[in-house]
Amino acid sequence: IPPHVQKSVNNDMIVTDNNGAVKFPQLCKFCDVRFSTCDNQKSCMSNCSITSICEKPQEVCVAVWRKNDENITLETVCHDPKLPYHDFILEDAASPKCIMKEKKKPGETFFMCSCSSDECNDNIIFSEEYNTSNPD
């Protein structure tokens, strides 16, 4: 951090490495919960027109797809991978792509993914073929 920028104690709005370099925040789709038509597809676009700067540099992009008897929703947010989201750990937070994984939730079908490239939660991937380690 340059000397004229104040350092603040216990501040999670800034992440620095040992050399004082500053980590950028993620750019993520951030429409909270919206109704969705994404169903029975290998991948879907979020149809979220809002790309936000995540509040904290450690946050990653998250997408949550839910289906019950009444509707399908897609949630797009930023979230800190050190904290659970919907009671689940974000295991794939370092992935450049948002690969959906099913989670057990009573009364609904629930998929969640997280990723750490800009706007990576705009394209959510359900297809098994992406679930192997893919460099890009």
Partner: nanobody
Framework: EVQLLESGGGLVQPGGSLRLSCAAS???????RMWWVRQAPGKGLEWVS?????????YYARSVEGRFTISRDNSKNTLYLQMNSLRAEDTAVYYC?????????????????WGQGTLVTVSS
């Protein structure tokens, strides 16, 4: 030598407007994503807005969405921030910064140079 020089700060009443400028030199302006970042007294950095080098795609923090507008003039190597409907909580030193180009997924993209900042005070 790389230089970023912010200007346009000052004292403004709540609900008022200000336009900040950042004059850039010493690097190829059109190769960099540019940012406005602010720091309120005794607080940490807050990431306010960013703009892509070409095509002028813009991004905002949720706290300023709809009130602030970032823009750039590549012919003048200048970055701008139009701030409307200002609130007391917008009081801060505003810095412009450039992001080192790199792959988008890289987790360690960094600021390599900072300006000295311009103080914005919103008070009645």
């Amino acid at each position: 030598e790389v230089q970023l020089l912010e200007s346009g700060g000052g004292l403004v009443q709540p609900g008022g407007s200000l336009r900040l400028s950042c004059a850039a030199s010493g690097f190829t302006f059109t190769e960099y994503r540019m940012w406005w970042v602010r720091q309120a007294p005794g607080k940490g950095l807050e990431w306010v807005s960013a703009i892509e080098p070409i095509g002028n795609r813009t991004y905002y923090a949720r706290s300023v969405e709809g009130r602030f507008t970032i823009s750039r003039d590549n012919s003048k190597n200048t970055l701008y921030l139009q701030m409307n409907s200002l609130r007391a909580e917008d009081t801060a030193v505003y810095y412009c910064a450039k992001q080192i180009p790199g792959r988008k997924w890289t987790a360690n993209s960094r600021f390599d140079y900072w300006g000295q900042g311009t103080l914005v005070t919103v008070s009645s």
